[in-house]
C-alpha cells in the first residue's frame, strides 16, 4: 500500500544557474493523496528560513504530482541563495531539501556564460 504522507520532491543539494533579468519559475513538486496541503516557500538566512510573503506563487497540476511554483519576474541579483518549500499537513510541517539559485548578473559579466560553464563551476557565480 502506497504511503499517503505528503512528500516534497526537491533533490538534496540541487541548484539552478540562472541570469538576472530573466523570468524563472522555482518548482516544489508535491505528492499528496486526498487534500492538497498548504505549501509555502522560504529563503534561508543562515540557519533560519524566512517565509516569503506577498510573492507571486501558483499551482500546476500534473498526472501524479502537483507543483507549487514561486515566480521570479524577473530574477534579481538579490534572489541568489537557498530556498525551501514546506507543507502543512495534519498539523505537521514537512520540509523539503533546500535548493540553491546561483544568479549571474549579466551586467557585470563580460559575456553571458554557457549553461555548462555555470553548471560545472557554480563557485564562479555569486557566493
Amino acid at each position: 500500500k502506497e504511503s499517503c504522507d505528503v512528500q516534497l520532491y526537491i533533490k538534496r543539494q540541487s541548484y539552478h544557474s540562472i541570469f538576472a533579468g530573466d523570468p524563472f519559475k522555482l518548482e516544489c513538486p508535491v505528492k499528496y493523496c486526498a487534500h492538497r496541503p498548504q505549501v509555502t516557500w522560504c529563503k534561508l538566512n543562515g540557519t533560519t528560513c524566512v517565509k516569503l510573503e506577498g510573492r507571486h506563487t501558483s499551482w500546476k497540476q500534473e498526472k501524479n504530482l502537483s507543483f507549487f511554483i514561486l515566480h521570479f519576474e524577473p530574477v534579481l541579483p538579490s534572489d541568489n541563495g537557498s530556498y525551501r518549500c514546506s507543507a502543512n499537513f495534519l498539523s505537521a510541517i514537512i520540509e523539503s531539501h533546500s535548493t540553491t539559485l546561483y544568479v549571474t548578473d549579466v551586467k557585470s559579466a563580460s559575456e553571458r556564460p554557457s549553461k555548462d560553464e555555470m553548471a560545472s563551476r557554480p563557485w564562479l557565480l555569486y557566493s
Partner: antibody, heavy 119, light 112 residues
C-alpha cells in the same frame, strides 16, 4: 530493481580521452543523481563527480581539474563520463553509481569496468 | 576537502567475533538539515562496492541486522555484532555532506 551497466573501451592511449557509458534500468534517472568513482588497482576509491540528470547540472572533484565531463541522456536513461588527457595514472576500475536524490533510499553501483591507459 | 580516516587499516578476526571499525572526518558531517551524510560500503575482491549503511545508522534493505552504524559530528563506527564468513571484505566509509565526496582509505577484514 535498480541496475547499472557500464560500457566502453578497456584500453586508451596516453593523452587520449577515456569514454564510458552507464545505462540504468529499474529507475527513471531524472529522479536520481548519477555519479562516477574510480579505483586504481589495489587502491582505494576516488569520487570523480556527479550529475543531476533532470537538468544536466554537474559537480566535479577539483582534483580532476577540467579533464572530466559527465553528461546524461534522459531519453536513453544513461549517463556518460569523458576523461581527457589521460596518463598511466588514470588506469583504474571505473564505477558508475546512482542514488535516490530525494530521500537517499537507494544507492546502487555498476559492476565496474577496468580501463588501462597504455600505448 | 574533508579527510576521512579509518582505523584500523586491516583487522584479523574470527567467525562469531564482534568487530568495530572507526571513521573520523576532518570536519563535522552535520548538514544544514540536521543530518550527517555518512555511508558505509562493503567491497569483496573483484566486485563493486555495495552500500550497507547510510545517514550514519540506517541499514540498506537486505543488509543483515548484525551490521550497525553509530556516531555523530566527526566520529563514526561500523559494528558487526557476530562475524559471518561472508563478512570478510574491505569496508569503506564515505561522506556525502560536502563536495567533493571523499572516502576513507578502507579497512580490510581478514580471517584469523
Amino acid at each position: 530493481q535498480v541496475q547499472l551497466q557500464e560500457s566502453g573501451p578497456g584500453l586508451v592511449k596516453p593523452s587520449g580521452t577515456l569514454s564510458l557509458t552507464c545505462a540504468a534500468s529499474g529507475v527513471n534517472i531524472k529522479d536520481t543523481y548519477m555519479y562516477w568513482v574510480r579505483q586504481p588497482p589495489g587502491k582505494g576509491l576516488e569520487w570523480i563527480g556527479r550529475i543531476d540528470p533532470a537538468n544536466g547540472y554537474t559537480r566535479y572533484n577539483p582534483s580532476f581539474k577540467s579533464r572530466a565531463t559527465i553528461s546524461a541522456d534522459k531519453s536513453k536513461n544513461q549517463a556518460s563520463l569523458k576523461l581527457s588527457s589521460v596518463t598511466a595514472a588514470d588506469t583504474a576500475v571505473y564505477y558508475c553509481a546512482v542514488y535516490d536524490g530525494y530521500y537517499e533510499s537507494f544507492d546502487v553501483w555498476g559492476q565496474g569496468t577496468l580501463v588501462t591507459v597504455s600505448s | 576537502d574533508i579527510q576521512m580516516t579509518q582505523s584500523p587499516s586491516s583487522l584479523s578476526a574470527s567467525v562469531g567475533d564482534r568487530v568495530t571499525i572507526t571513521c573520523r572526518s576532518s570536519q563535522s558531517l552535520l548538514d544544514s538539515d540536521g543530518k550527517s551524510y555518512l555511508n558505509w560500503l562493503q567491497q569483496k575482491p573483484g566486485k563493486a562496492p555495495k552500500r550497507l549503511i547510510y545517514l550514519v545508522s540506517k541499514l540498506d534493505s537486505g543488509v543483515p541486522s548484525r551490521f550497525s552504524g553509530s556516531g555523530s559530528g566527526t566520529d563514526f563506527t561500523l559494528t558487526i555484532s557476530s562475524l559471518q564468513p561472508e563478512d570478510f571484505a574491505t569496508y569503506y566509509c564515505w561522506q556525502g555532506t560536502l563536495f567533493p565526496r571523499t572516502f576513507g582509505q578502507g579497512t580490510k577484514l581478514e580471517i584469523k
